[in-house]
């Protein structure tokens, strides 16, 4: 039997044991989060699979993910949403300590897909473990990119109160319009629900005492937010290590001085 011809994409293929990983993560999440115990993980996997299996992987739409989004509906309490851009690890370390704040990856759908890659093939029920479309080299409407765009939009739309965002002060563009935060989340915050956006600019160098809140890209962010009648605040986090330490131990005497 001749092997079937398979489309070659520029990106890495589906993460090995993808179905098992998603299912296992779902079971683990629903066990740890009582408010999600009602979720049927087999239905979640079926909805996830249905979004990309048998579909041309450069023609995926947000509509494809709606059944999955519906099953994974979750609300974050007001003032507890943490967005991030180009500084995922620190954001996740923070919410692991500050358990009442949530990034997208602390929610069911984000948790399921974090760090995974997946895609299918047109007209077959197979998962492509060899290659998947690369956002730049192949197409932007691929299963992974569309998934994150869909769930990021929803996450931003449902945020309320004061929303926080962690930004990487070591990058040339601290606020980058091409990031998920810059292209999706910032435009989907709802002014009737969100009073303010507070940016935490995380410094990289120990000796870096500049006020990165005065960076032109941060002023750009304020300009975008201001037109939507959402207040904007910005804080420099000069010492991220100390910042995390002080979240863990706020009573520590060294935490009374600036971080």
């Amino acid at each position: 039997v001749l092997p079937r011809w398979r489309q070659q994409w520029s990106g890495s293929g589906t993460t090995s044991r993808f179905p098992e990983t998603v299912l296992a993560r779902c079971v683990k999440y629903t066990e740890v989060h009582p408010e999600m115990r009602h979720v049927d993980c087999q239905s979640v996997w079926d909805a996830f699979k249905g979004a990309f299996i048998s579909k041309y992987p450069c023609n995926i739409t947000e509509e494809d993910y709606q059944p999955l989004v519906k099953l994974g509906t979750q609300t974050v309490p007001c003032n507890k949403t943490l967005l991030w851009s180009r500084i995922k690890d620190l954001a996740h370390q923070f919410t692991q300590v500050q358990r009442d704040m949530f990034t997208l990856e602390d929610m069911l759908l984000g948790y399921l897909a974090d760090d995974l890659t997946w895609c299918g093939e047109f007209n077959t029920f197979e998962i492509n473990y060899q290659s998947c479309p690369d956002w730049r080299k192949d197409c932007s409407n691929n299963p992974v990119s569309v998934f994150w765009k869909t769930v990021s939009r929803r996450f931003a739309e449902t945020a309320c109160g004061v929303v926080h965002v962690m930004l990487n002060g070591s990058r040339s563009k601290i606020f980058d319009k091409n990031s998920t935060f810059g292209s999706v989340e910032v435009h989907n915050l709802q002014p009737e629900k969100v009073q303010a956006l507070e940016a935490w600019v995380i410094h990289g160098g120990r000796e870096d005492s500049r006020d990165l809140c005065q960076d032109p890209t941060i002023k750009e962010l304020e300009s975008i937010i201001s037109k939507r009648n959402i207040r904007f605040f910005c804080k420099n986090i000069y010492r991220p290590d100390k910042f995390l330490q002080c979240v863990k131990n706020p009573e520590d005497s060294s935490c009374l001085s600036g971080i």
Epitope: K173, K177, H187, Q190, P191, E192, P216, T217, K219, E220, E222, S223, I224, S226, K227, R228, N229, F232
Partner: antibody
């Protein structure tokens, strides 16, 4: 004194091009989003285009998309509007205006007149 | 056809109070920044109201209000120098654009 001064207007034939400039003084130009707004003879104000502080974001009215290009030179404190494939309906006074966060278009120039006619 | 709707004209006698309305939608007036501009004959527009606030230098006879998808400009103690065109404007989040009303010509009788 805070000031915006437009230049570059004039008479041009349909299909022709013009480049408008707006020189800023008296404020930190690189701290402000900038806009072009036009007003056809005897008509109301129509927003044309905007550019963000660093120039990485640009916005256009549907009526000029694909024909006009907004740009800025923060080192020269100057805003530009490159207008190509001009039409009779582009005839107007073109104003540049800064955008002050939470306020609006705070400072306006006096305008430069563009006439598109054969 | 303007995205924001204003009455084309309004009038009043000196000392009177006049209100100019501006109607929009959820994607502009309801959720986003609203401005009012005054354009005296032969001059460039001037920022008069942002949301419901007055920039410094604008007399307190001018006031702005907003309710749902509509905004209003009120001028009390009308004076002859208030004769001008008044425009409302708002950022429209769906269009990613500033939108203006068609303008209201205020005549002081």
């Amino acid at each position: 004194e805070v000031q915006l001064l437009e230049s570059g207007g004039g008479l041009v034939q349909p299909g022709g091009s013009l480049r408008l400039s707006c020189a800023a003084s008296g404020f930190t130009f690189s701290d402000y989003e900038m806009n072009w707004v036009r007003q056809a003879p005897g008509k109301g104000l129509e927003w044309v285009s905007a550019i963000s502080i660093t120039g990485s974001w640009t916005y256009y009215a549907d009526s000029v998309k694909g024909r006009f290009t907004i740009s800025r030179d923060n080192s020269e404190n100057t805003l530009y509007l490159q207008m190509n494939n001009l039409r009779a309906e582009d005839t107007a006074v073109y104003y540049c205006a800064n955008y002050k966060s939470y306020y609006g278009m705070d400072v306006w120039g006096r305008g430069t007149t563009v006439t598109v006619s054969s | 056809q303007s995205v924001l709707t204003q009455p084309p004209s309004a009038s009043g006698t000196p000392g009177q109070r006049v209100t100019i309305s501006c109607s929009g939608s959820r994607s502009n007036i309801r959720n986003n920044l609203v401005n009012w501009y005054q354009q005296l004959p032969g001059t460039a527009p001037k920022l008069l109201i942002y949301n419901t606030q007055r920039p410094s230098g604008v007399p307190d006879r001018f006031s702005g209000s907003k309710s749902g998808t509509s905004a209003s400009l009120a001028i009390s103690g009308l004076q002859s120098e208030d004769e001008a065109d008044y425009y409302c404007a708002s950022w429209d989040a769906s269009l990613n654009a500033w939108v203006f009303g068609g303008g209201t010509k205020l005549t002081v009788l």
